[in-house]
Interface confidence: medium
């Protein structure tokens, strides 16, 4: 429980965490470990998750063994019309976890944003919303006649019309990859994805790149020039690294991010490159993450709802991706 | 870009009332807190309470109970700091603010003068 | 009502590191923003959440907060840094302000 012996980390790799725990440096500095969440035990070789404005409180002196993780005290949050405190998680729907922490809230999705491509036993999939049930469901949807089946893959391939490209086709395995997903962040550092089965095993994968659309402190209204109706490649002034889990990015970067609309429509990224990007944390572990980059942007009016902001931004798409 | 605009410099004679107010502008004014914080001549930064413009609760700091009303109006953006029964000794500049997160932001202050 | 005590001032020479303490109970426990203020304006937040920095404040600015005492350090001080400094946090739903501290650059 205690710092006081050897670094001793299990032989595997650091642990998979569930969708919005930290993985974290123990305290002890020895091991990658799962951050505890709040109202979990910890210890000082189980630290609570720093991300989220945790600290284990330990209560009287005399335990200083095992604590509860327990939230600072922040800024309030307030949230369709109620009132959260800092380090309060809430349910605003049935499909989002959130938690305020001093003054913003951020949510996690809870059903799953998982893409299905269409296949021989399943060539109509799409989400339905059944009867009961919070988070939509993929149906497989039989076509009329049993005989159409054949035709719509071959149609699926774009074979009928174009023909197959031939780098697409490698040892039996047809390679299809989706769109980018939207950036999960209007502005600030997010998170986008894909499925694809361009691998050698030809198995479905989800991929994840960063992304930023913009800056959330840029005031970027100020530079749309007089008639034009998105600021299509603005720059930030000057060059600037790039800030995750407070790691910072080794090099820096002239980016290219998307302003704002004049005529009430989302200006999001429509060109985009993926590169990867190399971070520094202060513990000097260095990670490679791939990255977004915004070449064009486009204006559209499939903007976040007022009703479910986090459903459109995780449902619209990102186009004419280089990488 | 986020703006808190607020009413000019008043003058008061002890036992008066003074009504600031604080337009805000460039967010969704219903979203965050707007926090009222005095500083007179000289001295430091006194936080005098907050009001949630979405449901118009506030929450006042001890010193200030029974002489303070803060108010919105949602429909200009606007939030309002009452200060009753004034005395000399608050002779300040008052500051509407919204505090939390990584994004505060300080009205330019209101100089509100009490004297005889 | 809580109380957060600062030192009335703190005297730097030029290129040197100013550290300002900030006190109180349990403080490492709640969130500690810091403040500077120059006469005749608004306060401006150079950190928040015990040690991170709004775009725009160098980076010789830095926080840290625990047990019961938070310090801003200004590493590298210059003369445009001489200005007041307050620390602030939240005790439940209420904020707090330190009294103060003058930061003088000889």
């Known amino acids: 429980q205690n710092c006081s012996g050897p670094c001793r980390c299990p032989d595997e790799p650091a642990p998979r965490c569930p969708a919005g725990v930290s993985l974290v440096l123990d305290g002890c500095g020895c091991c990658r470990v799962c951050a505890k969440q709040l109202g979990e035990l910890c210890t000082e070789r189980d630290p609570c998750d720093p991300h989220k404005g945790l600290f284990c409180h330990f209560g009287s002196p005399a335990n200083r063994k095992i604590g509860v993780c327990t939230a600072k005290d922040g800024a309030p949050c307030i949230f369709g019309g109620t009132v959260y405190r800092s380090g309060e998680s809430f349910q605003s729907s049935c499909k989002y976890q959130c938690t305020c922490l001093d003054g913003a809230v951020g949510c996690m999705p809870l059903c799953s944003m998982d893409v299905r491509l269409p296949s021989p036993d399943c060539p109509f999939p799409r989400r339905v919303k059944l009867p009961g049930k919070c988070c939509e469901e993929w149906v497989c949807d039989e076509p009329k006649d049993q005989t159409v089946v054949g035709p719509a893959l071959a149609a699926y391939r774009l074979e009928d019309t174009f023909g197959p490209d031939p780098t697409m086709i490698r040892a039996n395995c047809l390679v299809q990859t989706t769109e980018w997903s939207a950036c999960s962040k209007t502005c600030g550092m997010g998170i986008s994805t894909r499925v694809t089965n361009d691998n050698a095993s030809c198995r479905l994968e989800k991929q994840s790149r960063l992304c930023m659309v913009r800056p959330c402190e840029a005031d970027l209204e100020e530079n749309i020039k007089k008639g034009k109706k998105c600021i299509r490649t603005p720059k930030i002034s000057k060059p600037i690294k790039f800030e995750l889990s407070g790691c910072t990015s080794m090099k820096t970067y002239r980016a290219k991010f998307c302003g704002v609309c004049t005529d009430g429509r989302c200006c999001t990224p429509h060109r985009t490159t993926t590169l990867p990007v190399e971070f520094k944390c202060p513990d000097g572990e260095v990670m490679k993450k791939n990255m977004m980059f915004i070449k064009t942007c486009a204006c559209h009016y499939n903007c976040p709802g007022d009703n479910d902001i986090f459903e459109s931004l995780y449902y619209r798409k990102m186009y004419g991706d280089m990488a | 870009e986020v703006q808190l605009v607020q009413s000019g410099a008043e003058v008061k004679k002890p036992g008066a009332s003074v009504k600031v107010s604080c337009k805000a502008s460039?967010?969704?004014?219903?979203?965050?807190?707007m926090h009222w914080v005095r500083q007179a001549p000289g001295q430091g930064l006194e936080w005098m309470g907050w009001?949630?413009?979405?449901?118009?609760?506030?929450n006042y700091a001890q010193k200030f109970q029974g002489r303070v009303t803060m108010t919105r109006d949602t429909s200009i953006s606007t939030a309002y700091m009452e200060l009753s029964r004034l005395r000399s000794d608050d002779t300040a500049i008052y500051y509407c603010?919204?505090?939390?997160?990584?994004?505060?932001?300080w009205g330019q202050g209101t100089l509100v003068t009490v004297s005889s | 009502q809580p109380v957060l005590t600062q030192p009335p001032s703190v005297s730097v020479s030029p290129g040197q590191t100013a550290s300002i303490t900030c006190s109180g109970d349990?403080?490492?426990?709640?969130?500690a923003s810091w403040y500077q203020q120059k006469p005749g304006q608004s306060p401006v937040l150079v950190i928040y959440?015990?040690?991170k920095r709004p775009s725009g404040i160098p980076e010789r600015f830095s926080g840290s907060n625990s047990g019961n005492t938070a310090t801003l350090t200004i590493s590298g001080t210059q003369a445009m840094d001489e200005a007041d400094y307050y620390c602030?946090?939240?005790?439940?739903?209420?904020?707090?302000f330190g009294g103060g501290t003058k930061v003088t650059v000889l």
């Open positions: 603010a919204r505090v939390g997160g990584s994004a505060h932001y």
């Open positions: 460039g967010y969704t004014f219903t979203g965050y807190y």
């Open positions: 009001i949630n413009p979405n449901s118009g609760g506030t």
């Open positions: 349990k403080l490492g426990h709640k969130y």
């Open positions: 959440q015990d040690r």
């Open positions: 602030q946090a939240w005790d439940s739903s209420h904020v707090v």
